[in-house]
Amino acid sequence: MKVLQEPTCVSDYMSISTCEWKMNGPTNCSTELRLLYQLVFLLSEAHTCIPENNGGAGCVCHLLMDDVVSADNYTLDLWAGQQLLWKGSFKPSEHVKPRAPGNLTVHTNVSDTLLLTWSNPYPPDNYLYNHLTYAVNIWSENDPADFRIYNVTYLEPSLRIAASTLKSGISYRARVRAWAQCYNTTWSEWSPSTKWHNSYREPFEQH
């Protein structure tokens, strides 16, 4: 049994880091493998992660962490029984994939303005709470070409757009994702999408 693709890990910078790797053949990850991880910190203890299958030869493990700070470094040991298959390390702050925003809501009752709001996925005491920026994706269910991205570079989890920038009388969907420039993170997954019917009053034409 050998590791074909070494484990790569990403952290949500809160409580979970996810590591994925591939073996050289079909493997029952949960029965044959264990991933041990330990914070390099005085008197910390090793923890065991039981991997799950992720395709025939792929494995994935969700490492539980109390919290994360930028200096944290973990040692990782991948075992098959008594055999050490791979040894490495992982610094969560260097491999951050933020949590997806939640509770995306479209408020359509504000004088022909669409107000989109969502929740920051981090608690206020987490470093990322004040460092997230967002991308909002809005698209038409009727017209695949009607697809737009709004970059929200301020901290407030909201976006205002004129309803008239979208077509009236049809349904739209929106979703939002996050990233943090400070840690050069990857983008989060998209939030669940929300749907609304776009309608607004056409302004009277002056003749």
Epitope: F41, L42, L43, S44, E45, D67, V69, S70, A71, D72
Partner: antibody, heavy 120, light 108 residues
Framework: EVQLLESGGGLVQPGGSLRLSCAAS????????MHWVRQAPGKGLEYVSG????????YYANSVKGRFTISRDNPKNTLFLQMSSLRAEDTAVYYC?????????????WGQGTTVTVSS | EIVLTQSPGTLSLSPGERATLSCRAS???????LAWYQQKPGQAPRLLIY???RRATGIPDRFSGSGSGTDFTLTISRLEPEDFAVYYC?????????FGQGTKLEIK
């Protein structure tokens, strides 16, 4: 209320032994790394020893290595420090201390201390 | 082993003034692992700041911590009578725990 209560201090002759205890209440001891810190009369704080959550890992300052042994009884919510081959320079107030993992070494709960005097 | 040196040894100030206490490490340390404590006569120390700049539970916002690398600072913005005490910095790292020798903050 979260509390640590040390006991077992006293007067002992050089070369003698003493066992300090620390009873924890208001929290589950097994969730925390625990430590002993001491303070000689009129002096600053000196780290003595620490033990991991389960007791699998221990650490000692060079000044006590080989003479002191830290241990814990998680079901009884109690921490111990067995001190032997005691010297005059071990005279101090000994504090039992909790370290919150989230605090990255910040010692957030301290006992009131127990006094150890090593003298002939 | 990293040595922490605090300065000044004694700081004499009046209530209402600003206090700046310094802690210097003999080599660069992680900001995540530096803490500050306050100790009054006959009492156990109390955690003020952890992770260089984060206040522990119940600590007034006149206390603040800053710094990086080898130089760290505890600032008390406006001294209250109850703030006169001894202050210690502490490093809890991957391989050891170290305290500074302390700074005594006394009433002028």
């Amino acid at each position: 209320e979260v509390q640590l209560l040390e006991s077992g201090g006293g007067l002992v002759q050089p070369g003698g032994s003493l066992r300090l205890s620390c009873a924890a209440s208001g929290f589950t001891l097994s969730s925390y790394a625990m430590h002993w810190v001491r303070q000689a009369p009129g002096k600053g704080l000196e780290y003595v020893s620490g033990i991991s959550h389960s007791g699998n890992s221990t650490y000692y300052a060079n000044s006590v290595k080989g003479r002191f042994t830290i241990s814990r009884d998680n079901p009884k919510n109690t921490l111990f420090l067995q001190m032997s081959s005691l010297r005059a320079e071990d005279t101090a107030v000994y504090y039992c201390v909790r370290v919150k993992r989230r605090y990255r070494g910040g010692m957030d709960v301290w006992g009131q201390g127990t006094t150890v005097t090593v003298s002939s | 082993e990293i040595v922490l040196t605090q300065s000044p040894g004694t700081l004499s100030l009046s209530p209402g003034e600003r206090a700046t206490l310094s802690c210097r490490a003999s080599q660069s340390v992680s900001t995540a692992y530096l803490a500050w404590y306050q100790q009054k006569p006959g009492q156990a120390p109390r955690l003020l700041i952890y992770g260089t700049s984060r206040r522990a539970t119940g600590i007034p916002d006149r206390f603040s911590g800053s710094g990086s690398g080898t130089d760290f600072t505890l600032t008390i913005s406006r001294l209250e009578p109850e703030d006169f005490a001894v202050y210690y910095c502490q490093l809890y790292g991957a391989t050891s725990v170290t305290f500074g020798q302390g700074t005594k903050l006394e009433i002028k």
